[in-house]
């Protein structure tokens, strides 16, 4: 192991869609991949009018997106389907959604908003 | 090296039947998922079926759902496509594909491909 | 299904060139989003999965980006062996699909 990176070798599964694609629908994934690439785990998930539905669950492949990240978390603003990546065993168990907040630079001079 | 070679391509008359055979080597066969892609004459690329490691769960495309059956041999590191009432619309050039292991499950390893032609 | 939509079909450029090609799913695919390059007569060959990760091998100048329907594939600098065909393949759901390809030709 690489000092100070968390290595990936299993990761909580999940299928929602796990009748029609005839897999299990929940367990661990043990994670394959080259020697010298790293693996991740991942979380993909809608948000249906606040309610939480996990769409898939499991091991990811080399993705520097994924990188040291320790926890997962999703930072797109409002996505159609969320999805999150991490490094460290069974790290996709626990997923969150913390958005970026998008800092614009302005163009021309700015606007004092009125005071109410 | 990692390799994928298909075989059992040809001519075959409408209704006909073929089967299809792909030898691995250089990975771990068992592991893996595997997938049979195809190519009409001058179009796009069509997924056709694919099977997991273990071989027991199999998928197949809308337009040979009933007609054709994937199976594999781990012991044999083999591949197959069993191909059964042929329609002309089935002549493509047909390639096995590994679909490498964790997500994002792309097709990372190919064979060069095997000609069938359903024709009378 | 998940339909997979690519634009153009087919483009002129020269060697040099930036290149762009655009992706369309149906629906979000979120990450399970691939592109691959083929040359007549071969077979396709992976060029980039999960959106934006270069498969070994494959040269820096290929790059891809996008996220949920939206993708794009972009050459940053046309090279004579990157004339070829050029497909997305969204691997978020069965059945797999594929673009209807982009062709790259010599300007």
């Known amino acids: 192991a690489i000092l100070g990176r968390s290595e990936t070798q299993e990761c909580l599964f999940f299928n929602a869609n796990w009748e029609k694609d005839r897999t299990n629908q929940t367990g661990v994934e043990p994670c394959y991949g080259d020697k010298d690439k790293r693996r991740h785990c991942f979380a993909t998930w809608k948000n249906i009018s606040g309610s939480i539905e996990i769409v898939k669950q499991g091991c990811w492949l080399d993705d520097i997106n994924c990188y040291d990240r320790t926890d997962c978390v999703e930072k797109k603003d409002s996505p159609e389907v969320y999805f999150c990546c991490c490094e460290g065993n069974m790290c996709n168990e626990k997923f969150s959604y913390f958005p970026e907040m998008e800092v614009t630079q302005p163009t021309s001079n700015p606007v004092t908003p009125k005071p109410p | 090296e990692v390799q994928l070679l298909e075989s059992g391509g040809g001519l075959v008359q409408p209704g006909g039947s073929l089967r299809l055979s792909c030898a691995a080597s250089?990975?771990?066969?068992?592991?893996?998922?595997m997938s049979w892609v195809r190519q009409a004459p001058g179009k796009g690329l069509e997924w056709v079926s694919a099977i997991s490691g273990s071989g027991g769960s199999r998928y197949y495309a809308d337009s040979v759902k009933g007609r054709f059956t994937i199976s594999r041999d781990n012991s044999k590191n083999t591949l197959y496509l069993q191909m059964n009432s042929l329609r002309a619309e089935d002549t493509a050039v047909y390639y096995c594909a590994r679909e490498q292991g964790p997500g994002p499950y792309a097709f990372d390893i190919w064979g060069q491909g095997t000609l069938v032609t359903v024709s009378s | 299904d998940i339909q997979m939509t690519q634009s153009p079909s087919s483009l002129s450029a020269s060697v040099g060139d930036r290149v762009t090609i655009t992706c369309r799913a149906s629906q979000s695919v979120s990450r399970f989003l691939n592109w691959y390059q083929q040359k007549p007569g071969k077979a396709p060959k992976l060029l980039i999965y999960g959106i934006s990760t270069l498969q070994s091998g494959v040269p820096s100048r290929f790059s891809g980006s996008g996220s949920g329907t939206d993708f794009t594939l972009t050459i940053s600098s046309l090279q004579p062996e990157d004339f070829a065909t050029y497909y997305c393949?969204?691997?978020?759901?069965?059945?797999?699909?594929f673009g209807g390809g982009t062709k790259v030709e010599i300007k």
């Open positions: 250089g990975f771990t066969f068992s592991s893996q998922g």
């Open positions: 393949q969204q691997s978020f759901s069965l059945p797999r699909t």
